[in-house]
Interface confidence: medium
């Protein structure tokens, strides 16, 4: 059964863009006009989870690549990673829990909470060129993003 997908670019609230810096790492940095096309486009799939008025379960893949953001426990800490998947199997309506994020809309911004690890969010650092990571909304880390729709 086909799964509903929409395509977006994400920027954190400091307007840093997300780029693929090596095969399995996303970084956040400010891009100028010349290299703006370096930013990744996410394929957002609407998947199994518990939707509510303020939370929508989604999976975030990288458009044109067989890579999905996933959340796993590493050395006792919830960790964000890019995971390679079988393109014949993904995306699917019922993704494994590690791929599921609760998309939470707060005013004009959006947050992505891990379904596997509640209260842990896709985050960026204040500093430039740092990896995107899973954070627990502490300190100066940024968890609010804006979404720019991209035509399929």
């Amino acid at each position: 059964v086909p799964i509903r997908q929409l395509h977006y670019r994400l920027r954190d609230e400091q307007q840093k863009s997300l780029v693929l810096s090596d095969p399995y790492e996303l970084k956040a940095l400010h891009l100028n006009g010349q290299n703006i096309n370096q930013q990744v486009i996410f394929s957002m799939s609407f998947v199994q989870g518990e939707p509510s008025n303020d939370k929508i379960p989604v999976a975030l893949g990288l458009k044109g690549k067989n890579l999905y953001l996933s959340c796993v426990m590493k050395d006792g800490t919830p960790t964000l990673q890019l995971e390679s998947v079988d393109p014949k199997q993904y995306p699917k309506k019922k993704m494994e829990k590690r791929f599921v994020f609760n998309k939470i809309e707060v005013k004009s911004k959006v947050e992505f909470e891990s379904a596997e690890f509640p209260n842990w969010y896709i985050s960026t650092s204040q500093a430039e060129h740092k990896p995107v990571f899973l954070g627990n909304n502490s300190g100066q880390d940024i968890i609010d993003f804006t979404m720019e729709s991209v035509s399929s």
Epitope: V1, Q48, G49, P51, Q89, K94
Partner: antibody, heavy 119, light 107 residues
Framework: QVQLQQWGAGLLKPSETLSLTCAVY????????WSWIRQPPGKGLEWIGE???????NYNPSLKSRVTISVDTSRNQFSLSLSSVTAADTAVYYC?????????????WGQGTLVTVSS | QSVLTQPPSVSVSPGQTASITCSGD??????AFWYQQKPGQSPVLVIY???KRPSGIPERFSGSNSGNTATLTISGTQALDEADYYC?????????FGGGTKLTVLG
């Protein structure tokens, strides 16, 4: 209140085709997936397949060659066809709704129809 | 396609806690669901998304899922909880059910 009401022939001969229909009363039809499940007498549940309002289907591979699930959105109905039946297909057949609010699982079920295959 | 394994039967005294397990390869990576079925009736969803209760299901029903095992727990079991219980998950885009567990409430 959502209700699923199902009907169809209850007694078949081997090699015939099983046909069941499920009508949905109450609630939206297009926002859900619609499934068929069966249960042989005294045994467990087996998922047959599902369909959405647009007619896109997903079948259990073990039955795929014999199963067709179709939908009639104008009547809020969906149907099951299972060809070349044998005694092993004797079961209670259930229709059910898969809802996004319960994580795309089966939150409302029909009353069940006992289908017996016997020569 | 994976197999979900349940014990055929579980017995419990009224007021005690009943635990029904469901095991499958990496089941904790997926969402688990539980259905109750009484004789001659259609199944009823009692737990969804590992540990959530549909409206109308008593608080004594709870669920957990990690590693290779999902567990349905019924605390303060009552006579009316006597039924067959089926776990369900998905694998390779198809729904898979466990073989079912008959819960007997003694006495």
């Amino acid at each position: 209140q959502v209700q699923l009401q199902q009907w169809g022939a209850g007694l078949l001969k081997p090699s015939e085709t099983l046909s069941l229909t499920c009508a949905v009363y109450g609630g939206s039809f297009s926002d859900y997936y619609w499934s068929w499940i069966r249960q042989p007498p005294g045994k467990g549940l087996e998922w047959i397949g599902e369909i959405d309002h647009s007619g896109s289907t997903n079948y259990n591979p073990s039955l795929k060659s014999r199963v067709t699930i179709s939908v009639d959105t104008s009547r809020n109905q969906f149907s099951l066809s299972l060809s070349s039946v044998t005694a092993a297909d004797t079961a209670v057949y259930y229709c059910a709704r898969a809802s996004p609010s319960s994580g795309w699982t089966l939150d409302y079920w029909g009353q069940g129809t006992l289908v017996t295959v016997s020569s | 396609q994976s197999v979900l394994t349940q014990p055929p039967s579980v017995s419990v005294s009224p007021g005690q806690t009943a635990s029904i397990t469901c095991s499958g390869d990496k089941l904790g990576d997926k969402f688990a669901f539980w259905y109750q079925q009484k004789p001659g009736q259609s199944p009823v969803l009692v737990i969804y998304l590992d540990n959530k209760r549909p409206s109308g299901i008593p608080e004594r029903f709870s669920g957990s899922n990690s590693g290779n095992t999902a567990t349905l727990t019924i605390s303060g079991t009552q006579a009316l909880d006597e039924a067959d219980y089926y776990c369900q998950a998905w694998d390779s885009n198809i729904e898979v059910f466990g073989g079912g567990t008959k819960l007997t409430v003694l006495g």
